[in-house]
Interface confidence: low
C-alpha cells in the first residue's frame, strides 16, 4: 500500500492532516525559512483538475506553485509519499521566483480503497518562507456508465402536424452522461432542423410530425467511459384520408319520367398513408329527378276543300295540334295546306294540265 | 410533493463564511440538479451554481471563487458556502431543484432566507 | 455571459387584458429559455420551460413562444392572481442567466 505522510511542524499543520510521522518525509521540509529577504506566499498558477479513471487507466493530478521552496500533495487529509511526486523546478525569469510544479498518479485501486461517504480527492500544498498555501480540492471519481437506460422512448403512431414527445433518461453515469438523438442512424441537429427540439431533461420533441418524420429514433447516451444506445422507438406519421370536393351534378338518367341525378367525390384530399383513417362518409349522392316526357306532333284532319277560285284551284287545310309537339317531341312530317285544280267555277284562265301544288308549312 | 427548505443564519460578519443548508423532502436528492440562486433585495435573480450527486458542480465565474456547493445523500440536503462575504452579498437566497443536465429549469424553490451581510 | 433583455420593465393592466411580455436574449439560444411567475415575498414559480412548454399546474392562459433571440410570454386574459413579477432565464449555457423581470401592476 502507499505510505502517508504528515509534517510535524505546527506552520504546516491542518486541521484534517492526519496519518504517522515519516522521517524520510520530513526532513524535506525545512523547521524553518530564511526570512530575508521577505517573500509572498505560494501562488497557485495551475491548480489541480478533477479527473476521472476509466476502466483501469490511472489519472495523472498536476499543479504549479509560486513562489515554492516545497510542493506536494495531500489526498484524503494524508500526504502523498514524497517517492510518488514527479517535482521540477525553475526560476521564473521575470520575477526571479522559483516555480515548483509537481505530478502525481492516482490508480483505480488506490480509489476503490478508500472507505467512506466521500469521494477521493487530492490538493497540493505549496511551501514559501512567507507561509503555506493550499490549492482546491481534485476530486477523483471512478467513471462508469450503467448499461440500463432509466427510461426508454417507445414507438408511437401519429397524425400529421402533431406534436410528438419521446422520452429518455440515459442510464447512471459518472460523469452523468450526455444524450443525442438518432433519426435512423443520423445525429438530430436542431440547430439545423427547427422541428425538432430537444429538452434539457433529454427528451426528444417533434413539433410538427412531417410525412419525413417517420422513421426509427433511438437515444443515445454517452460519457468518457461508454456509449449506449436505448432501444429504438418508431415513429409512423400517418395521414388521415379527407375528401375532394363534390362533383357536379349529373343529368338526370331518365329520358322519361322518374330517375335520379348523382354527383361523386374521392378520398383523394389527401389519400390515407401509413395507416391513416379512410375518409368517413357518403363517397356518392344521389337525388330524384323528372324528365318530362317528349310528346310527338300529330296531324288534325283536313278540312273540307275550299271553293274553286278564280286560279281554278281549291285547297284545303291541317294543323300540327293533335297534339302539338312538346318536351323535345318530333314536329309532324307532311302538308299543311293541300291545293288541287278544279273546274266548277269561271276561270280567269285556263288550267293547265299539271300536277297539284303543294305549299308546305314548316 | 417535492418540498425544499433553507437554513442557515440569517446575519453573517463582512469577511466571513456564509454557509446555508436545503433539506429536500418528499424526492430523493440522487437525480436533478441542485442549485442555488440568490435575489439582492428589490432587485433580480442571480444563479449561483448547481451540484449533481454525482459530484458534478457548475458556479457562477463572478463567484467562482469564493463558493463551493456540496451534497450530502445520506441526509438529503444541499449546501452552500459563499466566502470573505461583503455588504454586496446581502440577498434572499433560494434553494431549487433543476429539471434535467448542465441547463435546465428550476421546477421547485425554497421559500428563500434572507441573509444579511453586516458587522 | 448571455445577456436577457426583458420588455417592458413595468406595466399597468386591468382584469380580462391580454398582456405581452418579451425576452430578447443578446444570442442565439434555440427555444432554451424559461419564464417565472415571482409574488412579493415568495420564490419564483415555474410557468414555461423550454420556450414553449407549460409546467404541469399552470393555467393554460399563459403560453410562450420564440426562437432564437426572442421570446414571448403571453397572458390571454389577465386574471387578479396574476398581478406579479414575471423572470425570463436562458438555459443554453453557463452561467444560467435572468433576464430584469416585468412589473405587472393594476391599472
Known amino acids: 500500500g502507499s505510505h502517508h505522510h504528515h509534517h510535524h511542524g505546527s506552520d504546516y499543520k491542518d486541521d484534517d492532516d492526519k496519518g504517522s510521522q515519516d522521517d524520510e518525509f520530513f526532513h524535506e521540509l525545512p523547521e524553518t525559512f530564511p526570512s530575508d529577504p521577505p517573500e509572498p506566499l505560494p501562488h497557485f498558477l495551475i491548480e489541480p483538475e478533477e479527473a476521472y479513471i476509466v476502466k483501469n487507466k490511472p489519472v495523472n493530478l498536476y499543479c504549479k506553485a509560486s513562489p515554492a521552496t516545497q510542493i506536494y500533495f495531500k489526498c484524503n487529509s494524508e500526504w502523498v509519499h514524497q517517492k510518488d511526486h514527479v517535482v521540477d523546478e525553475r526560476v521564473d525569469e521575470t520575477s526571479g521566483l522559483i516555480v515548483r510544479e509537481v505530478s502525481i498518479e492516482i490508480s483505480r485501486q488506490q480509489v476503490e480503497e478508500l472507505f467512506g461517504p466521500e469521494d477521493y480527492w487530492c490538493q497540493c500544498v505549496a511551501w514559501s518562507s512567507a507561509g503555506t498555501t493550499k490549492s482546491r480540492k481534485a476530486y477523483v471519481r471512478i467513471a462508469y456508465l450503467r448499461k440500463t437506460f432509466e427510461q426508454e422512448p417507445l414507438g408511437k403512431e401519429v397524425s400529421l402536424e402533431q406534436e410528438v414527445l419521446l422520452q429518455c433518461r440515459p442510464p447512471e453515469g459518472i460523469p452523468v452522461a450526455e444524450v443525442e438523438w438518432l433519426k435512423n442512424e443520423d445525429i438530430i441537429d436542431p440547430a439545423e432542423d427547427r422541428n425538432f427540439y430537444i429538452t434539457i431533461d433529454h427528451n426528444l420533441i417533434i413539433k410538427q410530425a412531417r410525412l419525413s418524420d417517420t422513421a426509427n429514433y433511438t437515444c443515445v447516451a454517452k460519457n468518457i467511459v461508454a456509449k449506449r444506445k436505448s432501444t429504438t422507438a418508431t415513429v409512423i406519421v400517418y395521414v388521415n384520408g379527407g375528401w375532394s370536393t363534390w362533383t357536379e351534378w349529373s343529368v338526370c338518367n331518365s329520358r322519361c319520367g322518374r330517375g335520379y341525378q348523382k354527383r361523386t367525390r374521392t378520398c383523394t384530399n389527401p389519400a390515407p398513408l401509413n395507416g391513416g383513417a379512410f375518409c368517413e362518409g357518403q363517397s356518392v349522392q344521389k337525388i330524384a329527378c323528372t324528365t318530362l316526357c317528349p310528346v310527338d306532333g300529330r296531324w288534325t284532319s283536313w278540312s273540307k276543300w275550299s271553293t274553286c277560285g278564280t286560279e281554278c284551284t281549291h285547297w284545303r287545310r291541317r294543323e300540327c295540334t293533335a297534339p302539338a309537339p312538346k318536351n323535345g317531341g318530333k314536329d309532324c312530317d307532311g302538308l299543311v295546306l293541300q291545293s288541287k285544280n278544279c273546274t266548277d267555277g269561271l276561270c280567269m284562265q285556263a288550267a293547265p294540265d299539271s300536277d297539284d301544288v303543294a305549299l308546305y308549312g314548316s | 410533493q417535492v418540498q425544499l427548505q433553507e437554513s442557515g443564519p440569517g446575519l453573517v460578519k463582512p469577511s466571513e463564511t456564509l454557509s446555508l443548508t436545503c433539506t429536500v423532502s418528499?424526492?430523493?436528492?440522487?437525480?436533478?440538479?441542485w442549485t442555488w440562486i440568490r435575489q439582492p433585495p428589490g432587485k433580480g435573480l442571480e444563479w449561483i451554481g448547481y451540484?449533481?450527486?454525482?459530484?458534478?458542480?457548475n458556479y457562477n465565474p463572478s463567484l467562482k471563487s469564493r463558493v463551493t456547493i456540496s451534497v450530502d445523500t445520506s441526509k438529503n440536503q444541499f449546501s452552500l458556502k459563499l466566502s470573505s462575504v461583503t455588504a454586496a452579498d446581502t440577498a434572499v437566497y433560494y434553494c431549487?431543484?433543476?429539471?434535467?443536465?448542465?441547463?435546465?429549469?428550476?421546477?421547485?424553490w425554497g421559500q428563500g432566507t434572507l441573509v444579511t451581510v453586516s458587522s | 455571459d448571455i445577456q436577457m433583455t426583458q420588455s417592458p420593465s413595468s406595466l399597468s393592466a386591468s382584469v380580462g387584458d391580454r398582456v405581452t411580455i418579451t425576452c430578447r436574449a443578446s444570442?442565439?439560444?434555440?427555444?432554451?429559455l424559461n419564464w417565472y411567475q415571482q409574488k412579493p415575498g415568495k420564490a419564483p414559480k415555474l410557468l414555461i420551460y423550454?420556450?414553449?412548454s407549460l409546467q404541469s399546474g399552470v393555467p393554460s392562459r399563459f403560453s410562450g413562444s420564440g426562437s432564437g433571440t426572442d421570446f414571448t410570454l403571453t397572458i390571454s386574459s389577465l386574471q387578479p392572481e396574476d398581478f406579479a413579477t414575471y423572470y425570463c432565464?436562458?438555459?443554453?449555457?453557463?452561467?444560467?442567466?435572468f433576464g430584469g423581470g416585468t412589473k405587472v401592476e393594476i391599472k
Open positions: 431549487a431543484r433543476g429539471r434535467g443536465m448542465a441547463t435546465l429549469p428550476f421546477d421547485y
Open positions: 423550454a420556450a414553449s
Open positions: 444570442q442565439s439560444i434555440s427555444s432554451y
Open positions: 451540484i449533481h450527486n454525482s459530484g458534478t458542480t
Open positions: 432565464q436562458q438555459s443554453y449555457s453557463t452561467p444560467l442567466t
Open positions: 418528499g424526492g430523493s436528492i440522487s437525480s436533478y440538479f
